[in-house]
Amino acid sequence: QSSLTPLMVNGILGESVTLPLEFPAGEKVNFITWLFNETSLAFIVPHETKSPEIHVTNPKQGKRLNFTQSYSLQLSNLKMEDTGSYRAQISTKTSAKLSSYTLRILRQLRNIQVTNHSQLFQNMTCELHLTCSVEDADDNVSFRWEALGNTLSSQPNLTVSWDPRISSEQDYTCIAENAVSNLSFSVSAQKLCEDVKIQYTDTKM
């Protein structure tokens, strides 16, 4: 990737990622410098007859750093702080080639939950107020609520009325997704409204 247009690479929190490096064809490489956010990460001197000299210059990421045979950078056990700009400079006798990358760390979604604040009206209509959440949600998480294949809400919250006298059993499903994972959680309107009805009759007695 040229320095003008960094290659955007997705990594998953806790997993590994490779930043691919392409060599100039037919040229002898003198050394390769890898940088993270403009700070030196590693300095590599290739040798034709023996193993390359690899000098890791960033102790923070050092133990999680590895290099492939073609000197692509491999970073394991990814952390959120690995997010940022990476550059590789390949120096030959005649030129210096620069490759740029932007690493984005995404979380696998975990622990989807639905909270319910529902109420029963005098006419026995049940109004459901449902809120969906996942652990450590960020702006890259999309939420939606579906029932019978229709999207009823595009937000973590759903407000819907359910009348047991005219409605059949109905499940509402929250779907949370990001670029690397998705989770869903279904709730039964009938069950939620029965619970509200029990509370309603308990308080009346």
Epitope: N140, S142, W145, S153, Q155, N157, T159, N178
Partner: antibody, heavy 118, light 106 residues
Framework: QVQLVQSGSELKKPGASVKVSCKAS????????MNWVRQAPGQGLEWMGW????????RYADDFKGRFVFSLDTSVSTAYLQISSLKAEDTAVYYC???????????WGQGTTVTVSS | QIVLSQSPATLSLSPGERATLSCRAS?????MHWYQQKPGQAPRPWIY???NLASGIPARFSGSGSGTDYTLTISSLEPEDFAVYYC?????????FGGGTKVEIK
């Protein structure tokens, strides 16, 4: 039917403010996020950000942080976009668009042209 | 942010011809949405989640792709298909649109 109706065109002087409205009908307003999209003359579409119509919490794209404010009046199912300290480069058509999930904009307002000129 | 590059910028074709519109993302995305826009009009939803046609969209339109490469195909152009088409990604904030491909009559 589901529709979004926006307020009419505005001609403003640099430094002034403008408030664009987007009235929703035909669906439960608080169940779907509302997005704002800008289109400068002869240009493409730019996502400005969105507002959670249930909580009222806005989220702005980086280029639209500061002078741009999203707000709501849920009692009349209306979303608003306010732009302050107007500049000539704010001249554009501004669209509101409903998010049907996965940031797919299934219903769009007709657009409001804001012209900033001295 | 994820940059979407649409190509070609302009596609000059005759009615009845096949049109292939490309959208390339600077990073892998899960799905792509497409919109059609005609002069003086608001964009219209066209294809959602890569391959699903929006309500009322004729079957001559199709969408495909994965990762960084997505395509909108019109199997046989009708006069009403000449317009600008935009792709849009949802995987990462900010939600970004491509620069558009204008399909014009040759």
């Amino acid at each position: 039917q589901v529709q979004l109706v926006q307020s009419g065109s505005e001609l403003k002087k640099p430094g002034a403010s403008v408030k664009v409205s987007c009235k929703a009908s035909g669906y439960t307003f608080t169940n779907y996020g509302m997005n704002w999209v800008r289109q400068a003359p002869g240009q493409g579409l730019e996502w400005m950000g969105w507002i959670n119509t249930y909580s009222g919490e806005p989220r702005y794209a980086d280029d639209f942080k500061g002078r741009f404010v999203f707000s709501l009046d849920t009692s009349v199912s209306t979303a608003y976009l306010q732009i302050s300290s107007l500049k000539a480069e704010d001249t554009a058509v501004y669209y509101c668009a409903r998010d049907y999930g996965r940031w797919y904009f299934d219903v769009w307002g007709q657009g409001t042209t804001v012209t900033v000129s001295s | 942010q994820i940059v979407l590059s649409q190509s070609p910028a302009t596609l000059s074709l005759s009615p009845g011809e096949r049109a292939t519109l490309s959208c390339r993302a600077s990073s892998s995305v899960s799905h792509m949405h497409w919109y059609q826009q005609k002069p003086g009009q608001a964009p219209r939803p066209w294809i959602y989640a890569t391959s699903n046609l929006a309500s009322g969209i004729p079957a001559r339109f199709s969408g495909s792709g994965s990762g960084t490469d997505y395509t909108l195909t019109i199997s046989s152009l009708e006069p009403e298909d000449f317009a600008v088409y935009y792709c849009q990604q949802w995987s990462s904030t900010p939600r970004t649109f491509g620069g558009g491909t204008k399909v014009e009559i040759k």
